[in-house]
Interface confidence: medium
C-alpha cells in the first residue's frame, strides 16, 4: 500500500507553513529595508563570500551529515534545507527587532544575513537529535522557538555580560546541543518492534554523510571567524580552526581504529570526530596565540569525540531515544563545554599576563554566561518538546519513525533504495 502523508498533516502542514510565510512576508514589507548606501566593492565581495561559506555549511554540510539513516536520507537533507530557509528569515527579523527596532525599521545588511545563517545553523545542529521522529509541521515549531530563544539569549548576554558578537554567538555549540537533547528527551522514545533497521546507517547514505562532514570540515574556519571584525583576530581564528580540525581528523581516524577490537574504523565516529577540533576552539579561536595550542586542542577534542561516540550512544539511546548514528548532540555538548573551559583558562592567563586584576570576576562572568546559555537551552528545549507532543501536529506514528516513504513520493515504492 502506498504510504501517503497522513491526511491531517496534509491539511495542517501547507496551511501552517504558508500562513507563516505570508506573515513573514508582511513583516518584511512593513518593518525592513535594504541598506541603501554604496558599500566598497571589495569589502562587499569578501563579506558575501563568508556568508556563502556559512550557507554551504548549513545546506550541504549539516544537510548531508544527518542523512546517514538507511531509510531517512531524503528527509534529512530536504528538511534541513526547509528549516534553514525558514530559520534565516525569522532570525533576520528577530535580530533586527531586538537590536534596531526603536527606529521602526530593520536595516538588512550582509552582516545581518550572516548572523541569521549562524542562528539557523543552531537549529540544524539541534535537530539531529530528533530527525526521523518528527514531521515538517513540528520542525517549523522547533525552528521558531529555537531561533527566538537563541536570539534572546545573545541579546541578554551582550547586554548583561558585555560580550561582542563573536563571543555571544559561540555559545551556539552548547546551546544547540542541550536544546536538541532536551527536545529529544520529551519525544516518545521506544522504537516499536520491526523498525529497528530503519535507524541503521547504509553505505550510500553514509557516504553522503561523509560528504557533509567534508564540507563542514572545509568551511569550519569561516564559521569560527565570521563575526570577528579585526583582521588579525580573523586570521588567528582561521589558522587556529584549521590546525584544530586537521589534527582532529587524524585523531578521529586513528582513535576510531584504536577503539575497535579488530582495529576497524567506524564511519559514525569519523563523521562527527573530524569536526571536533572546530567546535573545541570555536570560543577562543581568536585568542589562541600559537598553532601548537590549537593542535593540542584538536587532539583532545578528537579523543573526546571518539570516546563519546563509543560509550555515550547506549546511554543516549536508552534515556533520550537518540539513535546511535545521531551523535552530534552529545558530541557538541561535550566539545562545546571543553571550548568554554579553554576560553576561561585563556582569559585567566590573558588577565594574569596583562597584570590586570579581577581574575575571579572575569571567570565568574564567563561561568555565568555559560550557565545562562545551558539553562535557556534546556528550558526552551523542554518547552519545544512539550509543544511537539501536542496532538495538533499529527506526529508520525512510532512505527513510521525514520521512514522517507511517510513524507516523499517515490515512483516505485521499495523498502531499500
Amino acid at each position: 500500500m502506498s504510504s501517503k502523508y497522513p491526511r491531517s498533516v496534509r491539511r495542517c502542514l501547507p496551511l501552517w507553513a504558508l500562513t507563516l510565510e505570508a506573515a513573514l512576508i508582511l513583516l518584511f514589507y512593513f518593518f525592513t529595508h535594504y541598506d541603501a548606501s554604496l558599500e566598497d566593492q571589495k569589502g562587499l565581495v569578501a563579506s558575501y563570500q563568508v556568508g556563502q561559506d556559512l550557507t554551504v555549511m548549513a545546506a550541504i554540510g549539516l544537510g548531508f551529515l544527518t542523512s546517514s539513516f538507511r531509510r531517512h536520507s531524503w528527509s534529512s537533507v530536504a528538511f534541513n534545507l526547509f528549516m534553514l530557509a525558514l530559520g534565516v528569515q525569522w532570525a533576520i527579523l528577530l535580530d533586527g527587532f531586538l537590536s534596531q527596532f526603536p527606529s521602526g525599521k530593520v536595516v538588512i545588511t550582509l552582516f545581518s544575513i550572516r548572523l541569521a545563517t549562524m542562528s539557523a545553523l543552531s537549529v540544524l545542529i539541534s535537530v539531529d537529535a530528533v530527525l526521523g521522529k518528527v514531521n515538517l509541521a513540528q520542525l517549523v515549531v522547533m525552528v521558531l522557538v529555537e531561533v527566538t530563544a537563541l536570539g534572546n539569549l545573545r541579546m541578554v548576554i551582550s547586554n548583561i555580560f558585555n560580550t561582542d558578537y563573536h563571543m555571544n554567538m559561540m555559545h551556539i555549540y552548547v546551546f544547540a546541543a542541550y536544546f536538541g537533547l532536551s527536545v529529544a528527551w520529551c519525544l516518545p522514545k521506544p522504537l516499536p518492534e520491526g523498525t529497528e533497521d530503519k535507524d541503521q546507517t547504509a553505505t550510500i547514505p553514509s557516504l553522503s554523510a561523509m560528504l557533509g562532514a567534508l564540507f563542514l570540515w572545509m568551511f569550519w574556519p569561516s564559521f569560527n571567524s565570521a563575526l570577528l571584525r579585526s583582521p588579525i583576530e580573523r586570521k588567528n581564528a582561521v589558522f587556529n580552526t584549521y590546525y584544530a580540525v586537521a589534527v582532529s581528523v587524524v585523531t578521529a581516524i586513528s582513535g576510531s581504529s584504536l577503539a575497535h577490537p579488530q582495529g576497524k574504523i567506524s564511519k559514525t565516529y569519523v563523521h562527527s570526530a573530524v569536526l571536533a577540533g572546530g567546535v573545541a576552539v570555536g570560543t577562543s579561536c581568536h585568542l589562541i596565540p600559537s598553532p601548537w595550542l590549537a593542535m593540542v586542542l584538536g587532539l583532545v577534542a578528537g579523543l573526546i569525540s571518539v570516546g563519546g561516540a563509543k560509550y555515550l550512544p547506549g546511554c543516549c539511546n536508552r534515556v533520550l531515544g537518540i539513535p546511535h548514528s545521531s551523535i552530534m548532540g552529545y558530541n557538541f555538548s561535550l566539545l562545546g563545554l571543553l571550548g568554554e573551559i579553554i576560553y576561561i583558562v585563556l582569559l585567566v592567563l590573558d588577565t594574569v599576563g596583562a597584570g590586570n586584576g579581577m581574575i575571579g570576576f572575569q571567570v565568574l562572568l564567563s561561568i555565568g554566561e555559560l550557565s545562562l546559555a545551558i539553562v535557556i537551552a534546556l528550558m526552551s528545549g523542554l518547552l519545544t518538546g512539550l509543544l511537539l507532543n501536542l496532538k495538533i501536529w499529527k506526529a508520525p506514528h512510532e512505527a513510521k519513525y525514520f521512514d522517507d516513504q511517510v513524507f516523499w513520493k517515490f515512483p516505485h515504492l521499495a523498502v531499500g533504495f
Epitope: H166, N356, L365
Partner: antibody, heavy 126, light 108 residues
Framework: QVKLLESGGGVVQPGGSLRLSCVAS????????MHWVRQAPGKGLEWVAF?????????YVDSVKGRFTISRDNSKNMVYLQMNSLRADDTAVYYYC??????????????????WGKGTTVTVSS | VVTQEPSLTVSPGGTVTLTCASS?????????PNWFQQKPGQAPRALIY???KKHSWTPARFSGSLLGGKAALTLSGVQPEDEAEYYC??????????FGGGTKLTVL
C-alpha cells in the same frame, strides 16, 4: 585614579619632527590598546593612531601613514608618537587615550577610548 | 565618512536624539559605536561605548542605541550642563577608527 599625561608638544617648522610622549598612572599600559587623537583649532576630533597592548599591531589614519610612528615601552608605562615630515595641517592638540577596562571576548584588542589625557599642542608653522 | 547633525537645540528637561551615520552602509553593533562629550577648552569625555554600554561616570539620562541604520545618543531630561559638542566614533575593522564631524548641542 587613572591619569594620562602627554608631553613633547611645541612649535616646529614644516618638514620638521617631534616626539610626543604619554605616561600613564593608576593602571598598567601593558593591559590595553592605546590611541592618539588630534583636534585642529576650531575643528572636530580625528583619530590618528593606535597600538595594541603588546605592540603587535599598529594602525594609522591614511593622512599620517609613513610619517608618524606609534610605539610603547611597557616597562616605563609610556607610549610615544614620533612625527616626521610635519605639515601645516598637522597643527592640532594631540590627545592620548586608553581603554580603561577590557571588553570580554576581545579582551586584547580594544577600540574604546575611555580615558583621555589633557592634550599637548603641536604647531607646525614657518 | 561618518556624518552627524552639525547642531541641535533643545529646551531644559526636554529629550533630544543625536545620530551618527556611516557612508559605507548601516551602522550595526559590529561597529562598536562610541559617544564622547567635549566642553569648550576641555578634553573629550567618554559617555557610551559598544552601542549602548555606559561608563561608571555616565549620567543615567544618556543612552545609546541603533536607530534605522544609525548609531544614536539620546538625552532625556536635558540639563543646562549638557550643552557641549558630541562626537561619535565608529570602528571599521582592522586599523580604522573614524570620528563623526560632531554635533553642537545648545540648551536654551
Amino acid at each position: 585614579q587613572v591619569k594620562l599625561l602627554e608631553s613633547g608638544g611645541g612649535v616646529v617648522q614644516p618638514g620638521g619632527s617631534l616626539r610626543l610622549s604619554c605616561v600613564a598612572s593608576g593602571f598598567t599600559l601593558r593591559s590595553y590598546g592605546m590611541h592618539w587623537v588630534r583636534q585642529a583649532p576650531g575643528k572636530g576630533l580625528e583619530w590618528v593612531a593606535f597600538i595594541w597592548f603588546d605592540g603587535s599591531n599598529k594602525g594609522y589614519v591614511d593622512s599620517v601613514k609613513g610619517r608618524f610612528t606609534i610605539s610603547r615601552d611597557n616597562s616605563k608605562n609610556m607610549v610615544y608618537l614620533q612625527m616626521n615630515s610635519l605639515r601645516a595641517d598637522d597643527t592640532a592638540v594631540y590627545y592620548y587615550c586608553a581603554r580603561e577596562k577590557a571588553l570580554r571576548g576581545i579582551s586584547r584588542y580594544n577600540y574604546y577610548l575611555d580615558v583621555w589625557g589633557k592634550g599637548t599642542t603641536v604647531t607646525v608653522s614657518s | 565618512v561618518v556624518t552627524q547633525e552639525p547642531s541641535l537645540t533643545v529646551s531644559p528637561g526636554g529629550t533630544v536624539t543625536l545620530t551618527c551615520a556611516s557612508s559605507t552602509g548601516a551602522v550595526t553593533r559590529g561597529y562598536y559605536p562610541n559617544w564622547f562629550q567635549q566642553k569648550p577648552g576641555q578634553a573629550p569625555r567618554a559617555l557610551i561605548y559598544s552601542t549602548n554600554k555606559k561608563h561608571s561616570w555616565t549620567p543615567a539620562r544618556f543612552s545609546g542605541s541603533l536607530l534605522g541604520g544609525k548609531a544614536a545618543l539620546t538625552l532625556s531630561g536635558v540639563q543646562p550642563e549638557d550643552e557641549a559638542e558630541y562626537y561619535c566614533l565608529l570602528y571599521y575593522g582592522g586599523a580604522q577608527l573614524v570620528f563623526g564631524g560632531g554635533t553642537k548641542l545648545t540648551v536654551l
